[in-house]
C-alpha cells in the first residue's frame, strides 16, 4: 500500500477504562494531530478504519464489529465498547485514508479491574478544594456522550467505600457533589456511579477522583521568613564553619512560583570570591503550604566574611520579603595568665 503518515504510538493518551463498563474512545487524529475534524474528512471521501494489537502480541488485527449485541461498534470518529472486557487491553490504531491520502495514530487502551471499594490501578485526576472557602462543587467527569439528554441516569456518590448520605458537609446533587465547607477530613477518593438504560440493558459508569483540600486564597499571605531572625546570632571564630539556614513559609497559592535566594553584600553568592555552598530542601503541609529551606554554608569563615551582610530573600505571587542574618565574630575568651591578670593590675 502507499505510504501512510504514521504519528506513532501516542502515549500521552494512555486511556484507562473499567472492565464491564461502556467506553467511548475518540480517534485522537482529529483531536490532536490533524487540522480538520471528522465531518470534513468524511465529506471529503476519507474513511476511518480501526484495528488493534492485543497486549503482548505484535500482530495487528482488524477489530471485530460483528460481536453479539454489537459489543464493539464504531460511530463517526468514536470507538464504542458496550461493555469492555479485560482482554480488550491493547494498542488501538485509527487510520484515515482514501486512495491518495493516509494518516494514522495508535494509542494504548488498558482495561482495568476495580474492587468493591473502587480501588484499582487507574490513575486518578486530582481536584483541589480550598479549605473553609464556602460552597465548592466537583462534577462527575467524562460522562458526556454516553446517553442522550432524554435519558435521566441515577447517580450515586461514594467517599472511599461508603455511600454519601447524611454526611455533615457533603451533599450529592445529581452529577455534582457539593462541599458546604471543605475541611482536611474531606481529603480522599470520591466515586460517582452513573447508571443508565440502553436498549433494554443497564450500564454503569464508574468515575473516581481524588479530592485534595488546599490552603485558601483568602488566607494566602506573602512569604514568612522564620530563619534568619532577630533572636539568633551566628557568632563564629575565623576558621570555623558558618551555617545559616534560610527557612521560608509560603502559603498555598495556585501555580505561584515560590523563590528563595541569598545575597551576600547585596550580590549573588557566586559573585563573591568566597567558597559558598547553598543546599535547598522543600517540604509541604497537608494543605500544600510550602516550606523551603536554603542553608548557606562557608566551610572556613574568615574575619572578613564575618563582616559581610547575609540576607535571605523570598518571593511568591503574594509578595517579596527579606531578612538579614545576625553574623558576628566571636570574641575569644580571655586567657587568665595574661589578659585577666592585667585586668587585676598584675605586672
Amino acid at each position: 500500500s502507499e505510504r501512510c503518515d504514521d504519528w506513532g504510538l501516542d502515549t500521552m493518551r494512555q486511556i484507562q477504562v473499567f472492565e464491564d463498563e461502556p467506553a467511548r474512545i475518540k480517534c485522537p487524529l482529529f483531536e490532536h494531530f490533524l487540522k480538520f475534524n471528522y465531518s470534513t474528512a468524511h465529506s471529503a471521501g476519507l474513511t476511518l478504519i480501526w484495528y488493534w494489537t492485543r497486549q503482548d502480541r505484535d500482530l495487528e488485527e482488524p477489530i471485530n464489529f460483528r460481536l453479539p449485541e454489537n459489543r464493539i461498534s464504531k460511530e463517526k470518529d468514536v470507538l464504542w465498547f458496550r461493555p469492555t472486557l479485560l482482554n480488550d487491553t491493547g494498542n488501538y490504531t485509527c487510520m484515515l485514508r482514501n486512495t491518495t491520502y493516509c494518516s494514522k495514530v495508535a494509542f494504548p487502551l488498558e482495561v482495568v479491574q476495580k474492587d468493591s471499594c473502587f480501588n484499582s490501578p487507574m490513575k486518578l485526576p486530582v481536584h483541589k478544594l480550598y479549605i473553609e472557602y464556602g460552597i465548592q462543587r466537583i462534577t462527575c467527569p467524562n460522562v458526556d456522550g454516553y446517553f442522550p439528554s432524554s435519558v435521566k441516569p441515577t447517580i450515586t456518590w461514594y467517599m472511599g467505600c461508603y455511600k454519601i448520605q447524611n454526611f455533615n458537609n457533603v451533599i450529592p446533587e445529581g452529577m455534582n457533589l457539593s462541599f458546604l465547607i471543605a475541611l482536611i477530613s474531606n481529603n480522599g477518593n470520591y466515586t460517582c456511579v452513573v447508571t443508565y438504560p440502553e436498549n433494554g440493558r443497564t450500564f454503569h459508569l464508574t468515575r473516581t477522583l481524588t479530592v485534595k483540600v488546599v490552603g485558601s486564597p483568602k488566607n494566602a499571605v506573602p512569604p514568612v521568613i522564620h530563619s534568619p531572625n532577630d533572636h539568633v546570632v551566628y557568632e563564629k571564630e575565623p576558621g570555623e564553619e558558618l551555617l545559616i539556614p534560610c527557612t521560608v513559609y509560603f502559603s498555598f497559592l495556585m501555580d505561584s512560583r515560590n523563590e528563595v535566594w541569598w545575597t551576600i553584600d547585596g550580590k549573588k553568592p557566586d559573585d563573591i570570591t568566597i567558597d559558598v555552598t547553598i543546599n535547598e530542601s522543600i517540604s509541604h503541609s497537608r494543605t500544600e503550604d510550602e516550606t523551603r529551606t536554603q542553608i548557606l554554608s562557608i566551610k572556613k569563615v574568615t574575619s572578613e566574611d564575618l563582616k559581610r551582610s547575609y540576607v535571605c530573600h523570598a518571593r511568591s505571587a503574594k509578595g517579596e520579603v527579606a531578612k538579614a542574618a545576625k553574623v558576628k565574630q566571636k570574641v575569644p575568651a580571655p586567657r587568665y595568665t595574661v589578659e585577666l591578670a592585667c585586668g587585676f593590675g598584675a605586672t
Epitope: 505561584s256 512560583r257 523563590e259 535566594w261 553568592p269 557566586d270 555552598t277 535547598e280 530542601s281 522543600i282
Partner: antibody, heavy 117, light 107 residues
Framework: EVQLLESGGGLVQRGGSLRLSCAAS????????MSWVRQAPGKGLEWVSS????????NYADSVKGRFTISRDNSKNTLHLQMNSLRAEDTAVYYC??????????WGHGTTVTVSS | EIVLTQSPATLSLSPGERATLSCRAS??????LAWYQQKPGQAPRLLIY???NRATGIPARFSGSGSGTDFTLTISSLEPEDFAVYYC?????????FGQGTRLEIK
C-alpha cells in the same frame, strides 16, 4: 567564565526519544534552578521545564507534561531533558538556561531537535 | 496560564530614535517581569528584570517600567546593535510564559 553547553540534539522519527544534556561551568551549579526553553523555527520562545537547585521540585509546560522529564546531576554539573513520544511540533532549538530568581540570566547556544514524520 | 501580549508586533525606527515596547499581562504578575533581547542566530539575553532593573552589563539607554498588568521597555536612543526581537516574560506563576515578541527593525 559562566558557561552552558547543550548536546544531544539531532534528527529523530516521530514517536521517538532523545536525551538532551547541558554541561554547566563557572558557577555553583547546585545553587541555581535550571530550565529548558525552546524556539521553533521562525517562532517565539516557549518555556519547557524547570528544576530547583536540589532537584526536589520540577515543573513542566502542559505541551510536554507526561512526555518530557527534567533531571540534574549536581555532582557532574549537568542538566538533562529526556524527551519521549516526540512530535513534529517539538522541532525546535532547545536552550539550557540558568534560572535565577529574577530571570534567565545565562543561556547556552542551543541544540537543534528535528522530529521528522 | 498568564498570557502576555506584546505590541506592536513590529516597530520600524531609525538609529537615534526612542523605542517604546509594550507588554500586557492577562492578570497581575506584580513586578515579576523580565525583558529579553534576541538577535538572529543567537540565544536570548536578559535585559531587564523585576520590571525596571537593568541586568549586568546592559547599557543605560535600556529602561523598564510598570507593574501589575502593564509594562514598558524603553530604549532612549537607538543604536544600530539594538535592532532585534524583544520578548517579555512573566515569572509570577507557573507556567512561565513569554510574550510573542516585538521585532524592532531599521526604518
Amino acid at each position: 567564565e559562566v558557561q552552558l553547553l547543550e548536546s544531544g540534539g539531532g534528527l529523530v522519527q516521530r514517536g521517538g526519544s532523545l536525551r538532551l544534556s547541558c554541561a554547566a561551568s563557572g558557577f555553583t551549579f547546585s545553587s541555581y534552578a535550571m530550565s529548558w526553553v525552546r524556539q521553533a523555527p521562525g517562532k517565539g520562545l516557549e518555556w519547557v521545564s524547570s528544576i530547583s537547585g536540589s532537584g526536589d521540585s520540577t515543573n513542566y509546560a502542559d505541551s510536554v507534561k507526561g512526555r518530557f522529564t527534567i533531571s540534574r546531576d549536581n555532582s557532574k554539573n549537568t542538566l538533562h531533558l529526556q524527551m519521549n513520544s516526540l512530535r513534529a511540533e517539538d522541532t525546535a532549538v532547545y536552550y539550557c538556561v540558568r534560572d535565577y530568581y529574577y530571570g534567565m540570566d545565562v543561556w547556552g547556544h542551543g541544540t537543534t531537535v528535528t522530529v521528522s514524520s | 496560564e498568564i498570557v502576555l501580549t506584546q505590541s506592536p508586533a513590529t516597530l520600524s525606527l531609525s538609529p537615534g530614535e526612542r523605542a517604546t515596547l509594550s507588554c500586557r499581562a492577562s492578570q497581575s504578575v506584580n513586578s515579576y517581569l523580565a525583558w529579553y533581547q534576541q538577535k538572529p542566530g543567537q540565544a536570548p539575553r536578559l535585559l531587564i528584570y523585576d520590571a525596571s532593573n537593568r541586568a549586568t552589563g546592559i547599557p543605560a539607554r535600556f529602561s523598564g517600567s510598570g507593574s501589575g498588568t502593564d509594562f514598558t521597555l524603553t530604549i532612549s536612543s537607538l543604536e544600530p546593535e539594538d535592532f532585534a526581537v524583544y520578548y517579555c516574560q512573566q515569572r509570577s506563576y507557573w507556567p512561565i510564559t513569554f510574550g510573542q515578541g516585538t521585532r524592532l527593525e531599521i526604518k
